[in-house]
């Protein structure tokens, strides 16, 4: 209303402090200078504003910065960040990792909100690639972040960033994503010795080709069954019984419990029953003795 637009005498805010929580919406609008709010944004987080009052403060900033807030303001938004829409955030140019951390902290412990997803997208696009420090930060707040990216987006991750990835960060990745990440991990860890290399590469092996699995089988790695079950079926099928035995080491006994599940089931169907019997695990379903196995894919390649 018209009579409410002027700030009442003596109510003009000289600083952002707790006295403002007693201001009505229209008083906040009329008595708080947007420039003052912008310079003292860091104080808002310590003041119990109502949701309605936060809407007013946001409106004041929107009027002051119609093209998008400057980073100096963004960094201190605190819980006012949660009042921003993805459309608001798309106007921002966030370049500082400190700003990103400050805003991720606001939503810490909760699922990734549309605001956070937009913020991360803006930040990563602005940087051009997902560097190690950014990846470190994002996976610390959101362990599943890496697996939320498409294979195309993952292709921009430099191998050096792979050092920041923890096994739990890959828990929800599908084979297509691991196909992209595995070669990067192989490159990143190439100078490590055998046992150390296996510890680092293990979480990425869902993207490994047959030849790499064959090479690992020569290194006494003792792969656990959980890792084996996540390997690509097409990469496991060509492995011989002897290679699988070497790859798994003492864990080979676990094959019996998994004989009905992929990739073990499909691998058993490709092995000679004689060879399976040498494991002494009672695995059934292999190719009976005396049967000739034709590798049609090899025949097609030759023709």
């Amino acid at each position: 209303e018209v009579e409410k637009t002027a700030c009442p005498s003596g109510k003009k805010a000289r600083e952002i402090d707790e006295s403002l929580i007693f201001y009505k919406k229209w008083e906040l609008e009329a008595c708080v200078d947007a420039a003052l709010l912008a310079t003292q944004m860091d104080r808002v987080n310590a003041i119990p504003f109502t949701y309605e009052q936060l809407d007013v403060l946001k409106h004041k900033l929107d009027e002051l910065y119609p093209q998008g807030y400057p980073e100096s303001v963004i960094q201190h938004l605190g819980y006012l960040f949660l009042k921003m829409s993805p459309e608001d955030i798309r106007k921002w140019n966030v370049t500082s990792l400190e700003t990103l951390k400050a805003l991720l902290e606001v939503n810490k412990g909760h699922e990734m909100s549309p605001q956070v997803a937009t913020l991360i997208d803006r930040f990563v696009k602005g940087r051009g690639q997902l560097d190690k420090d950014t990846l470190d930060t994002l996976t610390a707040f959101y362990p599943g972040y890496l697996c939320s990216l498409s294979p195309e987006e993952l292709s921009s991750v430099p191998p050096s960033s792979i050092w920041a990835v923890r096994p739990q960060d890959l828990d929800t990745c599908d084979p297509r994503q691991l196909d992209v990440l595995y070669p990067k991990a192989r490159l990143a860890f190439q100078n490590m010795n055998g046992s150390e290399y296996f510890v680092k590469i293990q979480s990425f092996l869902g993207g490994a080709p047959t030849e790499d699995l064959k090479a690992l089988s020569q290194q006494n790695v003792s792969m656990d069954l959980a890792t084996f079950m996540k390997l690509r079926t097409d990469a496991v099928l060509p492995l011989t019984v002897a290679e699988v035995q070497k790859l798994l080491g003492p864990h080979v006994e676990g094959l019996k419990a998994e004989e009905r599940h992929r990739p073990v089931r499909d691998w058993i169907l490709r092995q000679r029953q004689d060879d399976l019997d040498t494991l002494g695990l009672g695995l059934q379903g292999g190719i009976p003795n005396g049967y000739l196995v034709l590798d049609l894919s090899m025949q097609e390649a030759l023709s």
């Epitope: 119990p48 309605e52 009052q53 936060l54 819980y79 949660l82 009042k83 412990g109 909760h110 909100s113």
Partner: antibody
């Protein structure tokens, strides 16, 4: 005066769903945040979920994440809690409660509605 | 999530006593702590917010103090109407966790 009235409780089998409602009056519903808090028989209070005034932000306790959904209809002055995949441990009195901002306590509570999950 | 630990879990007292209930947060919550009173079969009632601010209509014998991780609720002159269960609750984060409760019963 502020009034919050919960409804929708009852006996339900494990794995089934139930939707609770909370009808609000006596204040500007669209201005305030709303919460669900539950209390198992003979036990303490457990905060369940909150939804901001405009529905833009929702937060949940770990114990209900992925199973419960909080929502609101500001045109009807009503808060909802959709409860799926119910378990025996979800048996409780469910209260709705108001907060006025992210850094505000729960200043008004309903009288609660009892949900019993049992086969 | 922030854990809230109340002590004692039960407290026996007489009318006229001064009683103190303690609440500890697993990490700093500044002063964003509330105290509630609940009687059997009733909804909780807000007593204190922001650690020490008395909610409108609550008798002045109730007082709160503390900041950071240590908080106390004091009832200076226990009245018959005060026998109930008391809960602390942090609202520093959007997951507003409660303490496990303290039952104040007649000695």
């Amino acid at each position: 005066q502020v009034q919050l009235v919960e409804s929708g409780g009852g006996v339900v089998q494990p794995g089934r769903s139930l939707r609770l409602s909370c009808a609000a009056s006596g204040f500007t519903f669209s201005s305030d945040g709303m919460n669900w808090v539950r209390q198992a028989p003979g036990k303490g209070l457990e905060w369940v979920a909150v939804i901001w005034n405009d529905g833009s932000n929702k937060y949940y306790a770990d114990s209900v994440k992925g199973r419960f959904t909080i929502s609101r209809d500001n045109s009807k002055n009503t808060l909802y809690l959709q409860m799926n995949s119910l378990r025996a441990e979800d048996t409780a009195v469910y209260y709705c409660a108001r907060d006025r901002g992210p850094l505000w306590p729960l200043d008004y509570w309903g009288q609660g509605t009892l949900v019993t999950v049992s086969s | 999530d922030i854990q809230m630990t109340q002590s004692p879990s039960t407290l026996s007292a007489s009318v006229g006593d001064r009683v103190t209930i303690t609440c500890r947060a697993s990490q700093s919550i500044s002063r964003w702590l509330a105290w509630y009173q609940q009687k059997p079969g009733k909804a909780p009632k807000l007593l204190i917010y922001k650690a020490s601010s008395l909610e409108s209509g609550v008798p002045s014998r109730f007082s709160g103090s503390g900041s950071g991780t240590e908080f106390t609720l004091t009832i200076s002159n226990l009245q018959p109407d005060d026998f109930a269960t008391f809960y602390c609750q942090q609202y520093n984060t959007y997951s507003r966790t409660f303490g496990q409760g303290t039952k104040v019963e007649i000695k």
